[in-house]
Interface confidence: low
């Protein structure tokens, strides 16, 4: 049996994946649950099995097709249901009419690389992954650099208010190890949120030339 309040949150990666998290305050005792997606104007429907991520929350990914296929558009509405098995029947635990392009969270940027590094600056590039062609240039990025003796949470955020898949970090310290991360967000969507942070890219600035002020 299920009691208590539940929260059901899903995001569309803009191409062929809807990721969902369902949180339930009450106890779920050995119950099998799944998310079911039923689009209003498509011939397919899809399910995924909810797997525990903590004591009171479950997650799953609805794989709608090939990673770069455009499975939904701005006019689609997808009815998403959490269904849990009760004996031989399935019970609806949560439901929402999901507008994919109002609830976007893109994949983390990939292919981070150092284009050029000097003593005090470093030019880094990256690529976006599985992002809809609908966005064209309507994306923004946040980046952060981890310097020695600090944590990621302390790192100041650098905002790029346009689709710019590179950055030139300046005022760096020579011969120092840094790490860099970036994330992306479309400008579209009332409930759109930032992508996860990219995998960190480690780089080291060049040592200062001997006999010169630094």
């Amino acid at each position: 049996a299920v009691n208590g309040t539940s929260q059901f949150t899903c995001f569309y990666n803009s191409r062929a994946n809807i990721s969902c998290v369902w949180s339930q305050d009450g106890a779920l005792q050995d119950t099998s649950c799944q998310v079911h997606a039923w689009p209003d104007r498509r011939r397919w429907n899809q399910t995924c099995e909810l797997l525990p991520v903590s004591q009171a929350s479950w997650a799953c990914n609805l794989i709608l097709g090939a990673p770069d296929s455009q499975k939904l558009t701005t006019v689609d509405i997808v009815t998403l249901r959490v269904l849990c098995r009760e004996g031989v029947r399935w019970r609806v635990m949560a439901i929402q009419d999901f507008k994919p392009f109002e609830n976007l969270r893109l994949m983390a940027p990939i292919s981070l690389q150092v284009v050029h590094v000097e003593t005090h600056r470093c030019n880094i590039s990256w690529e976006i992954s599985q992002a809809s062609h609908y966005f064209e240039r309507h994306l923004e990025f946040e980046a952060r650099t981890l310097s020695p003796g600090h944590t990621w949470e302390e790192a100041p955020l650098l905002t790029l208010k346009q689709k710019q898949e590179w950055i030139c970090l300046e005022t760096l310290t020579p011969d120092t190890q840094y790490e860099f991360q970036v994330r992306v967000k479309p400008l579209q969507g009332e409930f759109t949120t930032w992508s996860p942070w990219s995998q960190p890219l480690a780089f080291r600035t060049k040592p200062a030339a001997l006999g010169k002020d630094t």
Partner: nanobody
Framework: QLQLVESGGGLVQAGGSLRLACALS????????MAWFRQAPGKEREFVAS????????DYVASVQGRFTVSRDNNKNTVYLQMNSLKPEDTAVYYC????????????????WGQGTQVTVSS
């Protein structure tokens, strides 16, 4: 004030072609995603095609895919709809629409509209 003026409609035989044009004035053209809609007698206005501000991304309703082509000339502040292999069921008033948000262009209530141009396809 933003204004859209369509032209190019007319009477054509089935299988023929027409090219509609829509000129935008009163604002910067490249700010807008542009679209064509149509309304047949006794029916609701329906989306036909759209083109994003840069012209790189186009979208079509399934019934016109492969027959109609939407394009724009940002130097002339004009969007076009090239209609080939026309069918009697394409008969309608064709409307031009503009929206600064690509994602709202199919939404009937959030667009700026032209006055429409009549297209009649006879069999």
């Amino acid at each position: 004030q933003l204004q859209l003026v369509e032209s190019g409609g007319g009477l054509v035989q089935a299988g023929g072609s027409l090219r509609l044009a829509c000129a935008l004035s009163g604002d910067v053209f490249v700010r807008y995603t542009m679209a064509w809609f149509r309304q047949a007698p006794g029916k609701e206005r329906e989306f036909v095609a759209s083109v994003t501000d840069s012209g790189r991304t186009t979208d079509y309703v399934a019934s016109v895919q492969g027959r109609f082509t939407v394009s724009r000339d940002n130097n002339k502040n004009t969007v076009y709809l090239q209609m080939n292999s026309l069918k009697p069921e394409d008969t309608a008033v064709y409307y031009c629409a503009a929206n600064t948000d690509y994602f709202q262009i199919r939404s009937l209530d959030r667009n700026t509209w032209g006055q429409g141009t009549q297209v009649t396809v006879s069999s």
